[in-house]
């Protein structure tokens, strides 16, 4: 999947654009906003009906290189007696992000940007059952 | 930067770090052919803390087009299909990393960018702290 | 293209045991997770147990709970559900199910396999 040009009539592009040889892009890797420090809902992870613990994958060829995955707990959701209750699940929600893969290949390096599914947390749904006769 | 293992056989002079600024392949190489999206969509219609999309768009960013997930109820579904209110619906958030076009309007030029999304909704307990 | 095939119901006596058997056909088998769910006369449907394929990670129903068991066989692509000191309120159809992405969206087939339970 390609990144899309600017495609609006609007843009005019800059002469100040940077020379970037063809099928390739020029990307700054100091993050915007990195130290940006947001203000969690504090311990939502256990006091979910669908609770998830985290585990941190860590890859020190991809930038950055740890990146923290959910997995729910259960199977289905706890009730108000604080018990799991199987008629209805828990589910992982997940989002997708951008991460910098760093690829050897002899003595040169190469850069590819990489799609990463990442599961942030788990919600409690009604499951459905599609009957097949 | 992350420290990169190196073939020994290399010369020394490559930075064990990424470096600051890198020429990547435009195509995104995505790695996750095994997920299936085409049913996890409805999780915000099933969810006992169900959830609206809305449309979030920047032409200066890649992915341009991204959604942000809004909890519909401050409470959470119960099984007779109401709103139960000793229960909180939250929104789970996730910092992800997307490209700023940079210097602005630049085709092929961009900076990583860390912003924070909702990505859909959590049931809770709610925690009551009582300041005597 | 997967499927499942249940088989091993039949009629016994209340106290007895039965051990239910699901097949799935595909050879790249690797589902979130499986389950038995139950219809009975008049009755609503109703989940008896889940497994997680990953981690063999159990859960019943209360109903169940401490009676059945349900387990699985990834080389053989199957789940079982053993059944022990069965009731008369046991008596249902039981269908085999199976959630292939985690969705809670679960497939099942065909007839399902009658459980009676005899006082």
């Known amino acids: 999947r390609k990144i899309p040009k600017v495609g609006h009539t609007f843009f005019q592009k800059p002469e100040s654009c940077p020379p970037v040889p063809g099928g390739s892009m020029k990307l700054d890797i100091g993050i915007i906003n990195e130290n940006q420090r947001v203000s969690m809902s504090r311990n939502i992870e256990s006091r979910s009906t669908s609770p998830w613990n985290y585990t941190v994958t860590w890859d020190p060829n991809r930038y950055p290189s740890e990146v923290v995955q959910a997995q729910c707990r259960n199977l289905g959701c706890i009730n108000a007696q604080g018990k799991e209750d199987i008629s209805m699940n828990s589910v992982p929600i997940q989002q997708e992000t951008l991460v910098v893969r760093r690829k050897h290949q002899g003595c040169s390096v190469s850069f590819q940007l990489e799609k990463v599914l990442v599961t942030v947390g788990c919600t409690c749904v009604t499951p459905v059952i599609h009957h097949v006769q | 930067g992350i420290t990169i293992p190196r073939n020994p056989g290399c010369p020394n002079s490559e930075d064990k770090n990424f470096p600051r600024t890198v020429m990547v392949n435009l195509n995104i190489h995505n790695r996750n052919t095994n997920t299936n999206p085409k049913r996890s969509s409805d999780y915000y219609n099933r969810s006992t803390s169900p959830w609206n999309l809305h449309r979030n768009e920047d032409p200066e960013r890649y992915p341009s087009v991204i959604w942000e997930a809004k909890c519909r109820h401050l409470g959470c579904i119960n099984a007779d299909g109401n709103v139960d209110y000793h229960m909180n619906s939250v929104p789970i958030q996730q910092e992800i990393l997307v490209l700023r076009r940079e210097p602005p309007h630049c085709p092929n030029s961009f900076r990583l960018e860390k912003i924070l999304v909702s990505v859909g909704c959590t049931c809770v307990t709610p925690i009551v702290h009582h300041v005597a | 293209e997967v499927q499942l095939v249940e088989s091993g119901g039949g009629l016994v006596q209340a106290g007895g045991s039965l051990r239910l058997s699901c097949a799935a056909s595909?050879?790249?088998?690797?589902?979130?997770?499986m389950g038995w769910f139950r219809r009975a006369p008049g009755k609503a449907r109703e989940f008896v147990t889940l497994?997680?394929?990953?981690?063999?990670?159990?859960s019943y129903a209360d109903s169940v709970k401490g009676r059945f068991t349900i387990s699985r066989d990834s080389a053989k692509n199957a789940v079982y559900l053993q059944m022990d000191n069965l009731k008369p309120e046991d008596t249902a159809v039981y269908f085999c199910a199976v959630d292939l992405s985690g969705d809670a969206v679960y497939d099942s087939w065909g007839q399902g396999t009658q459980v009676t339970v005899s006082s």
């Open positions: 497994i997680s394929w990953s981690s063999g990670r159990t």
């Open positions: 595909g050879r790249t088998f690797r589902p979130y997770r």
